[in-house]
């Protein structure tokens, strides 16, 4: 767990889309695998904020026990608090569930800072503001943890939506989404719209406000503007993608594109920041500093430690550059770019701001485990995790924070050669050496 970096930080109506069409084999506009259009029952089913994670309401067991569960595309275990903890308002009580089955197996998940451990079992799980289905899923009942749960975050567990390869204790433990797709007619796709407030929210405001939407089994057109652009999922473990170019205010960082993906690039809703490999981070900060040189900030700000405050309503967004990440496209030698604003990478901090001040943390940080496109990136976009077609789609989010001069953007196509060379091939090592926490 890291302070406001890795979350947890490693900080309705029914109606399932049944009997849906499979993707058409056609060169015309490809049909998405899954219903398109309106998913009214799933819209606005997330709450939370980038610094503490976005969560969805789920029920576990019989009779159903309601819990708030962090949506995490950077891990693959469904794990819930199952014992009293000072930061938990409620927890999963296995003894009260007639459908709980013990797998008689433990699981231990260490992060860079902190850990959780628990006991594996299965139970019936459903998502009240999701598809109208119930599935039997693997559950890690967390009995002990350190620096995992976050005080005031209002979630009691984590829904790992990535692939089995990174599940703990090993890839034989089927992740929740795999179980859902296998046991129901829900298409193998989900999409996320994370809505950053753009201003600090206190705890009661978070509870009352909308945090976004997780559309299970499809795409909702009301959640984005413009077109969806897709990038291939390079390998099904994390949601790994390939970045082929980075620009700050249109200025190319001019690095070997392998550096951008060293040792991987992933899309991770459970991480707060945009995290960049050391060399890339240093180059990006140098460029952002140069672009915003009309004002000077302390070193601690660029390290994500110190806050910068302006009088309420006077934040000089215009002095900060836009950041563009070019992603490999679906067509050979074709890429597209996603562009975020300072409104995404300067994260409002609630516990310090007052009515007189707007305070922000710099939400781009250094990584030793590759690029992580965390909540600050995802808050600009509607992101489609099209597992069926092994691709991730990006479109401008209908809820992204912007100003009258600039907006987040998804644009293409651009001609980019030799994009395959941008991927880094991680040397094969014993799987147990995989880092769980992203430092």
């Amino acid at each position: 767990t890291q302070h406001g970096i890795r979350l947890p930080l490693r900080s309705g109506l029914g109606g399932a889309p049944l009997g849906l069409r499979l993707p058409r084999e056609t060169d015309e506009e490809p049909e998405e695998p899954g219903r398109r259009g309106s998913f009214v029952e799933m819209v606005d089913n997330l709450r939370g904020k980038s610094g503490q994670g976005y969560y969805v309401e789920m029920t576990v067991g019989s009779p159903p026990q309601t819990l708030n569960i962090l949506v995490d595309t950077g891990s693959s275990n469904f794990a819930v608090g199952a014992a009293p903890h000072p930061f938990l308002h409620r927890y999963y009580q296995r003894q009260l569930s007639s459908t709980y089955r013990d797998l008689r197996k433990g699981v231990y998940v260490p992060y860079t800072q902190g850990k959780w451990e628990g006991e594996l079992g299965t139970d019936l799980v459903s998502i009240p503001h999701g598809p109208n289905v119930t599935v039997r899923a693997n559950i890690a009942a967390i009995t002990e943890s350190d620096k995992f749960f976050i005080n005031g975050s209002n979630w009691e567990g984590i829904l790992g939506l990535a692939y089995a390869e990174i599940a703990r204790p090993d890839d034989s433990l089927e992740p929740f989404f795999d179980s859902l797709v296998k046991q129901t007619h829900v298409p193998n796709l989900f999409s996320l719209q994370l809505c950053g407030a753009g201003f600090p929210l206190n705890q009661s405001e978070v509870l009352a406000s909308v945090g976004g939407s997780m559309i299970i089994g499809g795409i909702d057109h009301s959640l984005y503007t413009g077109s969806l652009w897709y990038t291939p999922i390079r390998r099904e473990w994390y949601y790994e993608v390939i970045i082929v170019r980075v620009e700050i205010n249109g200025q190319d960082l001019k690095m070997d594109c392998k550096e951008y993906n060293y040792d991987k690039s992933i899309v991770d809703s459970g991480t707060t920041n945009l995290r960049l490999p050391k060399k890339v981070f240093e180059a990006a900060v140098k460029s952002i500093k140069a672009a915003s040189s009309t004002e000077k900030f302390p070193d601690g700000f660029w390290l994500g430690e110190q806050l910068v405050c302006w009088q309420a309503g006077t934040t000089p967004w215009n002095i900060f550059p836009v950041i563009s990440l070019y992603l490999m496209g679906e067509v050979t030698n074709q890429s597209f770019r996603i562009t975020i604003l300072p409104q995404q990478y300067l994260r409002p901090v609630e516990d310090v701001a007052t009515s007189q001040d707007d305070c922000y943390k710099f939400a781009i940080s250094q990584s030793s485990t590759g690029t992580v496109m965390g909540a600050v990136i995802m808050e600009g976009f509607y992101v489609v995790f099209d597992r069926a077609r092994k691709r991730i789609g990006f479109a401008v989010s209908a809820c992204h924070v912007h100003d009258e001069f600039r907006t987040a953007a998804v644009e293409g196509p651009f001609v980019t050669l030799d994009m395959e060379d941008c991927g880094y091939n991680i040397p094969q090592t014993d799987e147990s050496t995989l880092m769980t926490g992203r430092a």
């Epitope: 004002e295 000077k296 302390p298 601690g300 405050c309 310090v352």
Partner: antibody
Framework: QLQLQESGPGLVKPSETLSLTCTVS??????????WGWIRQPPGKGLEWIGM???????WYNPSLKSRVTISVDTSKNQFSLKLSSVTAADTAVYYC????????????WGRGTLVTVSS | EIVLTQSPATLSLSPGERATLSCRAS??????LAWYQQKPGQAPRLLIY???KRATGIPARFSGSGSGTDFTLTISSLEPEDFAVYYC??????????FGGGTKVEIK
């Protein structure tokens, strides 16, 4: 070594503008590593931050004084200045100039201070 | 804005005694806290920064500790020249505008 020295009138009439200058000697005000600030201390009271400036002209002001304060820099003279308009007796204080690091962002070097009395 | 509360307001001690000064922040300031010493008629002088690092030329009898909201300045054995007013300041938020109200260390 680097030193800071405040200068300016010790007496200002109410409603007038207080003007002070801080001269930096033994080093350059154009260092990219520092801001240059003003802090004041009313007699027998605590410290109040007024504002600061970077050699390029970028400024930060205390919101409670912002409407009355102007800080400017003259790199050719290695000086920075404070102007506080529409003064009242409540502005009577010892005014200090100081250096603020961007690496270690504290006031690591101070001038001796100059007492400014607002009185008719 | 973050408020810094220093206690006690006055500390009456004899030379050679240990002085313990407290500074409490209304919200966490991480380790971004400094201590200054101010003698009568003089400008403040930076003693400790980043909660526990001694500034250049500061004697080893001065030490700082704490993080988050609670901080302590300790003078292990008071020398006659240590009787002064001590201020804490947070720079967790930029610009660095918040000082504590001060603690006066006087001779008993």
């Amino acid at each position: 070594q680097l030193q800071l020295q405040e200068s300016g009138p010790g007496l200002v009439k109410p409603s007038e503008t207080l003007s002070l200058t801080c001269t930096v000697s033994g080093g350059s005000i154009s260092s990219s590593s520092y801001y240059w600030g003003w802090i004041r201390q009313p007699p027998g009271k605590g410290l109040e931050w007024i504002g600061m400036i970077y050699y390029s002209g970028s400024t930060w002001y205390n919101p409670s004084l912002k409407s009355r304060v102007t800080i400017s820099v003259d790199t050719s003279k290695n000086q920075f200045s404070l102007k506080l308009s529409s003064v009242t007796a409540a502005d009577t204080a010892v005014y200090y100039c100081a250096r603020v690091g961007l690496g270690v962002s504290y006031f690591d070097l101070w001038g001796r201070g100059t007492l400014v009395t607002v009185s008719s | 804005e973050i408020v810094l509360t220093q206690s006690p307001a006055t500390l009456s001690l004899s030379p050679g005694e240990r002085a313990t000064l407290s500074c409490r922040a209304s919200q966490s300031v991480s380790s971004y806290l400094a201590w200054y010493q101010q003698k009568p008629g003089q400008a403040p002088r930076l003693l400790i920064y980043d909660a526990s690092k001694r500034a250049t030329g500061i004697p080893a009898r001065f030490s700082g500790s704490g993080s988050g909201t609670d901080f302590t300045l300790t003078i292990s054995s008071l020398e006659p020249e240590d009787f002064a007013v001590y201020y804490c300041q947070q720079v967790y938020t930029w610009p660095p505008r918040t000082f504590g109200g001060g603690t006066k260390v006087e001779i008993k």
